[in-house]
């Protein structure tokens, strides 16, 4: 993503004591220069000159793309899903070759009844979306199908989907045990062979906000972390205020470097500040010595 953020320049002193001007860049930061036509702009860190300003790549911003942003947008999916591959054996319908053709009237009627039956079976599962028949084969009718589950993304989405898949297993086992043929007759919507019920595979959406955060932070990956607010993940550096991991720079400004977050301490007319967190103030002398 591209970012253009205007930045002002302030006189600051690093916690080591030297006065510097920000925006600034750590000497270890890689620098690339983008030159377009007659316009020469020092767009650093992969940024490029668009004719007016530097267009910066994540996680950089500033007039020359020399500063590191305090937070990076990460976008978890709105919903996450699971797909269960199941096999059940339906005994209340006899297999015919037409069932192999998904555009046949036989398949359409079977699909309608099977879907209705499964909707009844899974009606108490809020994550349940539906079923999709993938294959029908002889025996009476062996039904290979997918059960689709979906839920809103939360940090606990895997637990929610894991729990839902367990309930699916319980419910399909129950119905295929209870709805069985008696004297070659079925009084239910569908009857099953109890031993034909199998869960072949379960696939759950994989989304890791920490991984997305680290990837987008690039060489700063060790210093960006994920914190949650209202169940939404935020990819932040310690320089972002208002989070548990936020660095308090007191009388200074937080700045990211490739060695992590550091405080750049301010110097006022009356005090200069030092220390790792710019919390050590020293009053300036009122006497000025002229040489």
């Amino acid at each position: 993503p591209l970012a253009t953020i205007p930045v002002s320049t302030t006189s600051l002193t690093s916690s080591e004591g030297s006065t510097i001007s920000t925006p600034s860049v750590d000497i270890s930061t890689p620098v690339t220069t983008s030159i377009v036509g007659d316009q020469c702009s020092r767009c650093k860190n992969g940024g490029f000159w668009d004719g007016l300003k530097c267009q910066c790549l994540t996680p950089y911003y500033g007039e020359s793309c020399e500063e590191v942003v305090n937070s990076i947008d990460i976008a978890p999916p709105e919903t996450v899903s699971a797909q269960m591959e199941l096999t059940v054996t339906v005994t209340s319908v006899k297999f015919t070759d037409e069932l192999k053709n998904h555009s046949s009237q036989e398949f359409r009627e079977f699909n309608k009844t099977f879907t209705e039956q499964m909707n009844i079976v899974y009606s108490g599962i809020p994550e349940y979306v539906g079923v999709n028949i993938t294959n029908l084969r002889l025996g009476s009718v062996v039904v290979e199908h997918d059960v689709l589950l979906r839920t809103k993304y939360t940090p606990e989405y895997k637990t929610a989907l894991d729990n839902a898949t367990e309930v699916v297993k319980q419910k399909i086992t129950k119905v295929t045990t209870e709805q069985i043929m008696t004297n070659d007759n079925c009084s239910a919507l569908m009857c099953f062979n109890t031993t034909g019920t199998q869960v072949q595979n379960i696939t759950v959406t994989q989304y890791d906000p920490v991984e997305e955060c680290r990837q987008k932070a690039e060489e700063y990956e060790d210093y960006f972390l994920v914190e949650y607010r209202d169940q939404k993940p935020y990819c932040i550096s310690p320089c972002e205020s208002g989070f548990n991991a936020s660095k308090n720079c007191n009388h200074g400004k937080c700045q990211m470097s490739q060695n992590g977050a550091r405080c750049l301490c301010v110097t006022t007319e009356t005090h200069w500040y030092s220390g790792e967190d710019c919390n050590q103030g020293t009053q300036k002398s009122h006497h000025h010595h002229h040489h």
Epitope: V93, E106, M181
Partner: nanobody
């Protein structure tokens, strides 16, 4: 799409007979399943007599020995011969069909229905 039209219903005295017919349009008569269901006032629809193309037949216990299901493939017609009729046989009789070879008595598994014909057994 299969279309079903029943006929032959009416009023009959206890012990009497009726023959219901169900004419089917479409080319699916030789395959699948065919049947007769009935629904008495205030009761659920129930299977009376069913037949599938692989030879399976079903009769409700209450009609065994009295009712006979048959079909004439050349005429695309299903029949229900009802003998020794009783007052409790009074109901609307529905013809049902499915292209599937079914073994189920549950009306929800049957996809095609006629509009029904009324049978009243009364003295």
């Amino acid at each position: 799409e299969v279309q079903l039209v029943e006929s032959g219903g009416g009023v009959v005295q206890p012990g009497g007979s009726l023959r219901l017919s169900c004419a089917a349009s479409g080319d699916t008569f030789s395959r699948g399943s065919w049947g007769w269901f009935r629904q008495a006032p205030g009761k659920e629809r129930e299977a009376v007599a069913l037949i599938s193309s692989d030879g399976w037949t079903f009769y409700a216990d209450s009609v065994k020995g009295r009712f006979t299901i048959s079909q004439d493939n050349s005429k695309n017609t299903l029949y229900l011969q009802m003998n020794s009729l009783r007052a409790e046989d009074t109901a609307v009789y529905y013809c049902a069909a499915s292209v599937l070879v079914l073994r189920t008595l549950n009306p929800k598994a049957w996809h095609h229905w006629g509009q029904g014909t009324m049978v009243t057994v009364s003295s």
